[in-house]
């Protein structure tokens, strides 16, 4: 049976340009976690495998950073990076649970601030 | 030019244990995994684990838990595959393989090690 | 542990020609597959990954897509020196494991 739950940072917002760690947390049961898959829609952002370390997807690997932790950090944020992204927990001997994350990019403040101010 | 270099083949009695040696030159040891497959003559490939050379964690196919035991020595920059309780369907070529830099993909091979298991 | 299918153990086709190979998983593997070439008496090596990333020195044309569980490795036009088997592998989880292969064989 398994027993385990999935906490992750929920619904979170970045700014363009910026970055943001995807944190996910396996709680709740001794299950031994081999493997964490990170994925966003229907692409393979990145695999921490816990014995083998990581794999980063090529589409990924010039603004992706693996951790902290099982972990990802995703960097120079576009408005294309919007949407749902998923942990994917590979246990021993209990199976696989699944965290969502929702990210939300914002155009910067420093952006709209420029917009609505002018320096005198 | 990163370079993994096999033992030689062997011919083994039923029963007995083997280790097949992969010494790489090249490149960094410690930074990029070590794998092991398996290929059954004129069958297809099979992973049997792998392992990071860095913190000497090894990740295993569990049907060949019990089987194969990976090791590295790093003072030598070469990983071993210990294969015990040999029998007629271990008969296979061996190919060590590195994975690539934050990828599975596994870019460089060995030459293969032959094993023949027979009395 | 996730099968990988190569419904064509064989497949003949002449130079010139493009060929497809298929590899159908069990499961959902994302993008996490791979695709080899063995010649005769050598080792595999690696062509594509992830899966539609040609590696290193390999020819335009060799080309690979996909998503899911169903995979595709093209040649556009073969070659020769083609004459090989050609095997997926997922890596989406473990043990990763290597379709049956398709041996592709020259007229």
């Known amino acids: 049976m398994m027993t385990g739950t999935i906490e992750t940072t929920g619904n979170i917002s970045a700014e363009k340009g910026g970055s943001i760690i995807l944190q996910c947390h396996l709680s709740s049961t001794t299950a031994q976690v081999t493997q964490v898959n990170w994925e966003q829609q229907d692409q393979l952002l990145a695999i921490c495998n816990a014995d083998l370390g990581w794999h980063i997807s090529p589409s990924f690997k010039d603004r992706v950073a693996p951790g902290p932790g099982l972990g990802l950090t995703l960097q120079s944020l576009t408005v294309n990076d919007t949407g749902e992204y998923f942990c994917i927990y590979h246990t021993y001997p209990d199976g696989t649970y699944t965290g969502r994350i929702f990210l939300e990019v914002l155009e910067s403040s420093v952006a709209e601030h420029g917009a609505r101010f002018q320096i005198p | 030019e990163v370079q993994l270099q096999q033992s030689g083949p062997e011919l083994v009695k039923p029963g007995a244990s083997v280790k097949i040696s992969c010494k790489t030159s090249?490149?960094?040891?410690?930074?990029?995994?070590m794998h092991w497959v398996k290929q059954s003559h004129g069958k297809s490939l099979e992973w049997i684990g792998g392992?990071?050379?860095?913190?000497?964690?090894?990740s295993y196919n569990q049907k060949f838990k019990g089987k194969a035991t990976l090791t590295v020595d790093k003072s030598s920059s070469t990983a071993y595959m210990e294969l015990r309780s040999l029998t007629s369907e271990d008969s296979a070529v061996y190919y060590c393989?590195?994975?690539?830099?934050?990828?599975?993909?596994?870019?460089?091979w060995g030459q293969g090690t032959t094993l023949t298991v027979s009395s | 542990d996730i099968v990988m299918t190569q419904s064509h153990k064989f497949m003949s086709t002449s130079v010139g020609d493009r060929v497809s190979i298929t590899c159908k998983a069990s499961?959902?593997?994302?993008?996490?597959v791979a695709w080899y070439q063995q010649k005769p008496g050598q080792s595999p090596k690696l062509l594509i990954y992830?899966?539609?990333y040609r590696y290193t020195g390999v020819p335009d044309r060799f080309t690979g897509s996909g998503s899911g569980t169903d995979f595709t490795f093209t040649i556009s036009s073969v070659q020769a020196e083609d004459l090989a088997v050609y095997y997926c592998?997922?890596?989406?989880?473990?043990?990763?494991?290597f379709g049956g292969g398709t041996k592709l064989e020259i007229k």
């Open positions: 992830s899966p539609s």
């Open positions: 499961q959902y593997v994302s993008t996490a």
């Open positions: 392992i990071n050379p860095n913190n000497g964690g090894t």
């Open positions: 592998q997922q890596h989406y989880s473990t043990p990763w494991t």
């Open positions: 090249g490149y960094t040891f410690t930074e990029y995994t």
């Open positions: 393989a590195r994975s690539g830099h934050m990828d599975y993909g596994y870019v460089y």
